[in-house]
Interface confidence: low
């Protein structure tokens, strides 16, 4: 239903309060560089002109589309070209173009200073100092961090900020209270922060069918009572929800998410009996525990699948009719049968089913030739299944850091081109893969553990994108987006990598190793280890297995002794002349 | 320990009224949504009203629609549940309870109880 006024629209839906949030965040997104006091008088200038268009739709300007208002805001900036460089030819070309440009100039590993957590007491006084600039400043800080963050989620996330901050600065032990609260979110933050990132890549890098295809199948497996037609509008509304929000259209992505939280909630009985709990809550708990609802229970006696989709006279007649309708209901089918299968394998089976009636339908016997295409789906559905168990198997022997480790070896041997900060940080997020799916039982450990995986390589993808430096990267990213993880799993060492030169600095450590956290502790042990791989690709699991070793006992002895700055150049020398004998450096 | 204290209960006739006060102590009320609850013998704990944190935004069971009237004083860090025309199907012990920054729709929503006051309507 089209508005007079479309920024009129949004803040009377959304409220100032939100309205003010999303601008901030779309801004921050945008103009990941720019300080945050600039970024809130811009977001002032348009929640006061929002309001004289609230107030009279007819007034000048209030016609504009958003992306108009908002472009023409942000390329008001007077440090545009010295910040962004080109990105300010963005502000040259005419909407839509100069949205895309925005877009394409988003920075998923901006150049900006580790966020540090200041005292307990320091962010406490913040807090109740002026608690609407410190909230506006966590979104702030995220959202330039996270260009991707689905912005009504960040909302979510920054309402429980502001009720961990409000309960624990009056606790008697402030820092007991808070400090879990806000490890927490921090890590339930990156987690959402990489699994929108997948949605978006989806989107943008594969279109609009592949993104369907996945949230047809997940949908399924989640609202397995659901009918098919039920499925395909959620389907159809979650679509163009993340289109918004991935396309830098925050108020409406917001907007339309909250009307399909309160369809969803209004049509529960024929969606789901697990929302009830959800549909209780406040609007942005609502849409999370939407987001996160667990399946329903699958129907008791649902047919064979080879009724339909092989035995059938009319496959080929029903998948020439609509074809894509046909494929959509054959995911729904299997989806919502087999919840303990991943979407990508799901989606991996479609492509298998749809390749194989492209081909039998043009033969002379299409029914012969497809009959056995279940027999296909074999291979596909072991090869997860014996990948986890193996992995599992070796997470259970080796726990999480050396779990890490062992991936670290895997994947630097693979693709030695890349950055060894990506490497560290991809393969230590693979690792994580065993503390967050092994504990499951069988059922629920493959969609945990490969739709996890997709999220993971997808970082590496990103990165990889932004300064592509391995020919074997670019083409499993690019090939298949339900095949990436099998592709990066096929990989062997690369043979054609020259090694890199040895470099002792590299292996110098110093005595601020000690005041480290245990997580900082492992990082520069595994960024060492990566170095190692680098210099001695060849080099065999157990002489890895010697050094490192010898390192966390150099590192050991060292922060004991009286004069570590000492003992650590002194250690430091012999360490590296052991570890070149050893592997022969 | 977060809490909460009803006051004001106590006996009314009917088309009576009464004010009932929750006062928090260790800690303050602004981030906090306050609801009023009441269990009758034998009955399920019920939602009578409710106010967000913001105070702009108040609610009520339709059983007490236009006689009862919920505020907050946020100085005093007291909420308040103005009560009139009270009717014998009123009596029962009446609750506040605390939530985060916003109303909940469910008892269980509610983080911090008080004890109650009781207050029985009758001639």
């Known amino acids: 239903d089209a508005h007079k006024s479309e920024v009129a629209h949004r803040f009377k839906d959304l409220g100032e309060e939100n309205f003010k949030a999303l601008v901030l965040i779309a801004f921050a997104q945008y103009l990941q560089q720019c300080p945050f006091e600039d970024h809130v008088k811009l977001v002032n200038e348009v929640t006061e002109f929002a309001k004289t268009c609230v107030a009279d739709e007819s007034a000048e300007n209030c016609d504009k589309s958003l992306h108009t208002l908002f472009g023409d805001k942000l390329c008001t900036v007077a440090t545009l070209r010295e910040t962004y460089g080109e990105m300010a030819d963005c502000c040259a070309k005419q909407e839509p173009e100069r949205n895309e440009c925005f877009l394409q100039h988003k920075d998923d590993n901006p150049n900006l200073p580790r966020l540090v957590r200041p005292e307990v007491d320091v962010m406490c006084t913040a807090f109740h100092d002026n608690e609407e600039t410190f909230l506006k400043k966590y979104l702030y800080e995220i959202a330039r961090r996270h260009p991707y963050f689905y912005a009504p989620e960040l909302l979510f996330f920054a309402k429980r900020y502001k009720a961990a901050f409000t309960e624990c600065c009056q606790a008697a032990d402030k820092a007991a209270c808070l400090l879990p609260k806000l490890d927490e979110l921090r890590d339930e933050g990156k987690a959402s922060s990489a699994k929108q990132r997948l949605k978006c890549a989806s989107l943008q890098k594969f279109g609009e069918r592949a993104f369907k295809a996945w949230a047809v199948a997940r949908l399924s497996q989640r609202f397995p009572k659901a009918e098919f037609a039920e499925v395909s509008k959620l389907v159809t509304d979650l679509t163009k929800v993340h289109t918004e929000c991935c396309h830098g259209d925050l108020l409406e992505c917001a907007d339309d998410r909250a009307d399909l939280a309160k369809y969803i909630c209004e049509n529960q009985d024929s969606i789901s009996s697990k929302l009830k709990e959800c549909c209780e809550k406040p609007l942005l708990e609502k849409s999370h525990c939407i987001a996160e609802v667990e399946n329903d229970e699958m129907p008791a006696d649902l047919p064979s699948l080879a009724a339909d989709f092989v035995e059938s006279k009319d496959v080929c007649k029903n998948y020439a009719e609509a074809k894509d309708v046909f494929l959509g209901m054959f995911l729904y089918e299997y989806a919502r049968r087999h919840p303990d299968y991943s979407v990508v394998l799901l989606l991996r089976l479609a492509k298998t089913y749809e390749t194989t009636l492209e081909k039998c339908c043009a033969a002379a016997d299409p029914h012969e030739c497809y009959a056995k295409v279940f027999d296909e789906f074999k291979p596909l559905v072991e090869e997860p299944q014996n990948l986890i168990k193996q992995n599992c198997e070796l997470f259970e022997q080796l726990g999480e850091y050396k779990f890490q480790n062992a991936l670290l070896v895997r994947y630097t041997k693979k693709v030695p081109q890349v950055s060894t900060p990506t490497l560290v940080e991809v393969s230590r997020n693979l690792g994580k893969v065993g503390s967050k799916c092994c504990k499951h039982p069988e059922a629920k450990r493959m969609p945990c553990a490969e739709d996890y995986l997709s999220v993971v390589l997808n970082q590496l993808c990103v990165l990889h994108e932004k300064t592509p430096v391995s020919d074997r990267v670019t083409k499993c990213c690019t090939e298949s987006l339900v095949n990436r993880r099998p592709c990066f799993s096929a990989l062997e060492v690369d043979e054609t990598y020259v090694p890199k030169e040895f470099n002792a600095e590299t292996f110098t450590f110093h005595a601020d190793i000690c005041t480290l956290s245990e997580k900082e502790r492992q990082i520069k042990k595994q960024t060492a280890l990566v170095e190692l791989v680098k210099h001695k690709p060849k080099a065999t699991k157990e002489q890895l297995k010697a050094v490192m070793d010898d390192f966390a006992a150099f590192v050991e002895k060292c922060c004991k002794a009286d004069d570590k700055e000492t003992c650590f150049a002194e250690e430091g020398k012999k360490l590296v002349a052991a570890s070149q004998a050893a592997l022969g450096l | 320990q977060v809490q909460l204290q009803e006051s004001g209960g106590g006996l009314v006739q009917p088309g009576g009224s009464l004010r009932l006060s929750c006062a928090a102590s260790?800690?303050?009320?602004?981030?906090?949504?306050i609801g009023w609850f009441r269990q009758a013998p034998g009955k399920e704990r019920e939602g009578v009203s409710c106010i967000a944190s913001s105070g702009g935004s108040t609610n009520y069971a339709d059983s007490v629609k236009g006689r009862f009237t919920i505020s907050r004083d946020n100085a005093k860090n007291t909420v308040y549940l103005q009560m009139n025309k009270l009717k014998p199907e009123d009596t029962a012990v009446y609750y506040c309870a605390a939530a985060v920054l916003e109303c909940r729709t469910v008892v269980r929503g509610y983080d911090y109880w008080g004890q109650g006051t009781q207050v029985t309507v009758s001639s």
């Open positions: 260790r800690f303050t009320l602004d981030y906090y949504a």
